[in-house]
Interface confidence: low
């Protein structure tokens, strides 16, 4: 649809409240260091301009693209050069290069202070004093720390955030009501951000085709009763939505996501029997619910896959006529029959099938050549199955914290050049796969575990891309999206690594560790563990376990001491000496 004024079109479609919220998110995701007040001022200016265009679409500048309007507005920020350095050079460019330039400067790990949660009474007072500013500040703080957060979904989080304060600030025990809700929102928000980051990485690094393949597989698992043409339509629309959001086109993205939810609900009879409850909800809840909806039951009478994709004499003819469509159909048919497989496994199978057809359809006897293609799938299926079985056994044996430690050691030995904070963050998240997925029955373990690991390993990839230090990480991250996890799994100890010089300061602890939460204390200990492995990559599990046990005892002892700081100073020296001796440093 051609509209005289794109900004007026989106303002009318989305309404003023959503328009303002989405523009704030967009600006905060681009200019991550700007103060809140500056962003609010910019958003208000854009909103006032949009209203003039709603009143008269022919008014001056109303015909400009959103990228032009928003880019021009961002480029008015006075401190752009001082705050952002070379990002200011983007403003010398014309659209569309300017927007591409802004996108390239999004920072996955911005140098921002950790968000500290104020006292409950302080938060409730702020909420009551100015609800609008309070909620805008939430959007701003999340968006600037997560520059690829899925904007329409962030509106859903903000709605829940508001509901939590509305309910709990009136409760008898405000803290007991509010804090668990805020913890849940924080954890869900981090997970949502990481999932969306993988979608954007898929699009940006591997192309639209890669994203569409992922979407075909996932939607076919979720909607196995839907016909291929229906799934294809949903995939095309979903790809457009995520392309827009990943590309900073948040107004278009939110608008198109609403249209997609509307379409799905209007056509749920031909899509899935599980959508009824979702479709009765208001828009933001509806879209979220559809995105998380459980897999529909598989049709009972699905024929064997082999008939169309191996036994048919028309395989090469069908493949040659429309390669992407034929491979898409293969992926659809395989995925709808296998909700027990991870999406990445399904994509590996499709890639193997494609490679086989490329080779065999040029052979003298194509059918003879590809007749056993399904046999090639067996080892691909067994590899993640075995890996998940082994790791779930280890998780059940060790519990989450010690399982994380085992992964910390494993990954530090594989890629010791990676920064310690990144190794700790990524290994802790990898370790959460145990409590997240190992509780599931066999049929749900692989999709849960391997697709979650894809999300976590993507965090490693995007953090490493900012400051590359390891060729092995670069190789696993860039060669194949679907083989990232097997690539990392296959890495052995890096024999080329020169151990880090020993620095006693790294292992010096103070009494402040005693007042930390259990999680923060774990992170301190896990940081020390990574540093130990970097000093002594050949240390055995037993040696590392002994040192970590001594370390835990040392912290416990000194936190109980009357003069904690003296205890940490004196006992700490002894611990460092003992650890050096135990590890032969």
């Amino acid at each position: 649809d051609a509209h005289k004024s794109e900004v007026a079109h989106r303002f009318k479609d989305l309404g003023e409240e959503n328009f303002k919220a989405l523009v704030l998110i967009a600006f905060a995701q681009y200019l991550q260091q700007c103060p809140f007040e500056d962003h609010v001022k910019l958003v208000n200016e854009v909103t006032e301009f949009a209203k003039t265009c709603v009143a008269d679409e022919s008014a001056e500048n109303c015909d400009k693209s959103l990228h032009t309007l928003f880019g021009d507005k961002l480029c008015t920020v006075a401190t752009l050069r001082e705050t952002y350095g070379e990002m200011a050079d983007c403003c010398a460019k014309q659209e569309p290069e300017r927007n591409e330039c802004f996108l390239q400067h999004k920072d996955d790990n911005p140098n921002l202070p950790r968000l500290v949660r104020p006292e409950v009474d302080v938060m409730c007072t702020a909420f009551h004093d100015n609800e609008e500013t309070f909620l805008k500040k939430y959007l701003y703080e999340i968006a600037r720390r997560h520059p690829y957060f899925y904007a329409p979904e962030l509106l859903f989080f903000a709605k829940r955030y508001k509901a939590a304060f509305t309910e709990c600030c009136q409760a008898a025990d405000k803290a007991a009501c509010l804090l668990p809700k805020l913890d849940e929102l924080r954890d869900e928000g981090k997970a949502s951000s990481a999932k969306q980051r993988l979608k954007c990485a898929s699009l940006q690094k591997f192309g639209e085709r890669a994203f569409k393949a992922w979407a075909v597989a996932r939607l076919s698992q979720r909607f196995p009763k839907a016909e291929f043409a229906e799934v294809s339509k949903l995939v095309t629309d979903l790809t457009k939505v995520h392309t827009e959001c990943c590309h900073g086109d948040l107004l278009e993205c939110a608008d198109d996501r609403a249209d997609l939810a509307k379409y799905i609900c209007e056509n749920q009879d031909s899509i899935s029997s599980k959508l009824k409850e979702c479709c009765e909800k208001p828009l933001l809840e509806k879209s979220h619910c559809i995105a998380e909806v459980e897999n529909d039951e598989m049709p009972a009478d699905l024929p064997s896959l082999a008939a169309d994709f191996v036994e048919s004499k028309d395989v090469c003819k069908n493949y040659a006529e429309a390669k992407d469509v034929f491979l898409g159909m293969f992926l659809y048919e395989y995925a709808r029959r296998h909700p027990d497989y991870s999406v990445v496994l399904l994509l590996r199978l499709a890639k193997t099938y494609e490679t086989t057809l490329e080779k065999c359809c040029a052979a003298a006897d194509p059918h003879e050549c590809y007749a056993k293609v399904f046999d090639e799938f067996k080892p691909l299926v067994e590899e993640p199955q075995n890996l998940i079985k082994q790791n779930c056994e280890l998780f059940e044996q060790l519990g989450e914290y010690k399982f994380q430690n085992a992964l910390l050691v494993r990954y530090t030995k594989k890629v010791p050049q990676v920064s310690t904070p990144t190794l700790v963050e990524v290994s802790r998240n990898l370790g959460k796969v145990g409590s997240k997925c190992c509780k599931h029955p066999e049929a749900k373990r692989m999709p849960c575990a391997e697709d979650y690991l894809s999300v976590v390993l993507n965090q490693l990839c995007v953090l490493h891309e900012k400051t590359p230090v390891s060729d092995r990480v670069t190789k696993c991250c860039t060669e194949s999206l679907v083989n990232r996890r097997p690539c990392f799994s296959a890495l052995e100890v890096d024999e080329t690594y020169v151990p880090k010089e020993f620095n006693a300061e790294t292992f010096t602890f103070h009494a402040d560790i005693c007042t930390l939460s259990e999680k923060e204390r774990q992170i301190k200990k896990q940081t020390a563990l990574v540093e130990l492995v970097k000093h002594k990559p050949k240390a055995t599990k037993e040696q590392l376990k002994a040192v970590m046990d001594d370390f835990a005892a040392f912290v416990e002892k000194c936190c109980k001491a009357d003069d904690k700081e003296t205890c940490f100073a004196e006992e700490g020296k002894k611990l460092v000496a003992a650890s050096q001796a135990a590890l032969g440093l």
Epitope: E100, Q204, E208, R209, C246, H247
Partner: nanobody, 127 residues
Framework: QVQLVESGGGLVQAGGSLRLSCAAS????????MGWFRKAPGKEREFVAA????????YYRDSVKGRFTISRDNAKNTVYLQMNSLKSEDTAVYFC????????????????????WGQGTQVTVSS
């Protein structure tokens, strides 16, 4: 491999029109996203227009919108750039480019994502 050959360039008065063609040999163009780029003396190569392979979506740089039109004829294995209301700042060597795997629609502006390039055709607009 795809070989791309541009034609249709030349000298034209400001306000005039030209139609550039890009003919492909070696493989069918229907598999590719196609783009036009240009390079003026002393300037970086810049995106002009693009057309996608699946849905024929078109994208233009702001300064040529409404004046230039990109189109494709898969049967003739050719992509066109119709340039009207030409201005002196449109003077440049125009390159045709093809790419196999689209990333973003608006990322069509990214020249490093294109796999194949033509040699270029000179367009000079005199005032």
């Amino acid at each position: 491999q795809v070989q791309l050959v541009e034609s249709g360039g030349g000298l034209v008065q400001a306000g005039g029109s030209l139609r550039l063609s890009c003919a492909a040999s070696g493989r069918t163009l229907s598999s590719y996203d196609m783009g036009w780029f240009r390079k003026a003396p002393g300037k970086e190569r810049e995106f002009v227009a693009a057309i996608t392979r699946h849905d024929y979506n078109t994208y233009y740089r702001d300064s040529v919108k409404g004046r230039f039109t990109i189109s494709r004829d898969n049967a003739k294995n050719t992509v066109y750039l119709q340039m009207n209301s030409l201005k002196s700042e449109d003077t440049a060597v125009y390159f045709c480019a093809a790419r196999l795997d689209p990333i973003f629609a608006s990322n069509s502006a990214y020249s490093n994502l294109y796999d194949y390039w033509g040699q270029g055709t000179q367009v000079t607009v005199s005032s």
